[in-house]
Amino acid sequence: QTDMSRKAFVFPKESDTSYVSLKAPLTKPLKAFTVCLHFYTELSSTRGYSIFSYATKRQDNEILIFWSKDIGYSFTVGGSEILFEVPEVTVAPVHICTSWESASGIVEFWVDGKPRVRKSLKKGYTVGAEASIILGQEQDSFGGNFEGSQSLVGDIGNVNMWDFVLSPDEINTIYLGGPFSPNVLNWRALKYEVQGEVFTKPQLWP
C-alpha cells in the first residue's frame, strides 16, 4: 500500500503497453458505486481516450469512463453506455465524479464540482467483483487487448472509489479537498502495479 497523496501517474506518450493496474479488496458484487478522480490531458480535441477501465471476465466494459472526441464523456456500466456532452473543450486539469446505483439505475456525473443532469442506466444490474481495474488503457478483454489510439496521454490522480453513492455534499467536499474515506479504492493507501512507461510525479492541480 502506498500513500499517493499529492502525486499523479504520468503517461508521457501514446502506447498500448503502458498502464497502471489498481487492486481493489472487493468480495461481493457492487449494487452501487462512486468513482472520483483528477486528470489532465491535451488529447480531448484530438481523439478519444480511456479515463477509468473496470473489466470482469464476463464483461470487459463493466465500468468504463471514456472521453469520446466531438461528444464528451462516455459512461458505461455492464456494456451499456450513456453520454454526457461537453460542447467546448478546454485544456485544464479536470475533476470528475460519477456514481451509479442498481436500484434506480440512476447515474450522476459531476465535472469540476458541477452536476450534470441525472440519467438512467442498467437498473437492476450488479457489477462483478472480480475485476481488473486499469488506468491509462481501455480493456477490450480482461486485463488486456489494449489499443494505443485509446490510451491516455497525460496525468491522472486522486482516484478513489466507494461501494455506495456519495451525496452531493460529500462530492462537493471531495472536490474542495476536504476529508473522505473511500472503501474500494483509496488514493492514500493504494495497491497498484505499473507496466511500461508510467511515472509518478507531484500533482499539477491544487
Epitope: F66, S68, G79, S80, E81, S120, L121, K123, E138
Partner: nanobody, 117 residues
Framework: EVQLQQSGPELVKPGASVRMSCKAS????????IHWVKQSHGESLEWIGF????????YYYKNFRGKATLTLNKSSSTAYMDLRSLTSEDSGVYYC??????????WGQGTILTVSS
C-alpha cells in the same frame, strides 16, 4: 450466435422518407446499445446515433439531428431507423452495430439506400 439482420435495399425519390430495420438475435437485446452508421461511396464511416434498448434513450450525432429517428420494438428485438427529407447525399450503405461509441463488436450486413428521381 450473435446476429444483426438488416432489411433489404431501398430505392426512393428525393424528398421521401425511408425506414430500415435491424433484427437482433443470439443475445439479450436490452443488454447492448444499437448504433447506426453510414458509409457513402468511397468515404469513411459516419456515426449517426444510437438507441438504448433497455430504456429507449437515444443519442444523435450533430450531422443527423433532424434527419434520423431511431426507435425499437423490444418484443421482436428489432431496431429501426427512419430517414426523412431524403436527397442524393443520403445515398449509401447504412449499418447497425451492437456496442458503444468506444467499440462495436457485431455488425449487420448493411442496407443499401439509393435516392434518385
Amino acid at each position: 450466435e450473435v446476429q444483426l439482420q438488416q432489411s433489404g435495399p431501398e430505392l426512393v425519390k428525393p424528398g421521401a422518407s425511408v425506414r430500415m430495420s435491424c433484427k437482433a438475435s443470439g443475445y439479450t437485446f436490452t443488454d447492448y446499445n444499437i448504433h447506426w452508421v453510414k458509409q457513402s461511396h468511397g468515404e469513411s464511416l459516419e456515426w449517426i446515433g444510437f438507441i438504448n434498448p433497455d430504456n429507449g434513450d437515444t443519442y444523435y450525432y450533430k450531422n443527423f439531428r433532424g434527419k434520423a429517428t431511431l426507435t425499437l420494438n423490444k418484443s421482436s428485438s428489432t431496431a429501426y431507423m427512419d430517414l426523412r427529407s431524403l436527397t442524393s447525399e443520403d445515398s449509401g450503405v447504412y449499418y447497425c452495430a451492437r456496442g458503444t461509441t468506444v467499440e462495436k463488436d457485431y455488425w449487420g450486413q448493411g442496407t443499401i439506400l439509393t435516392v434518385s428521381s
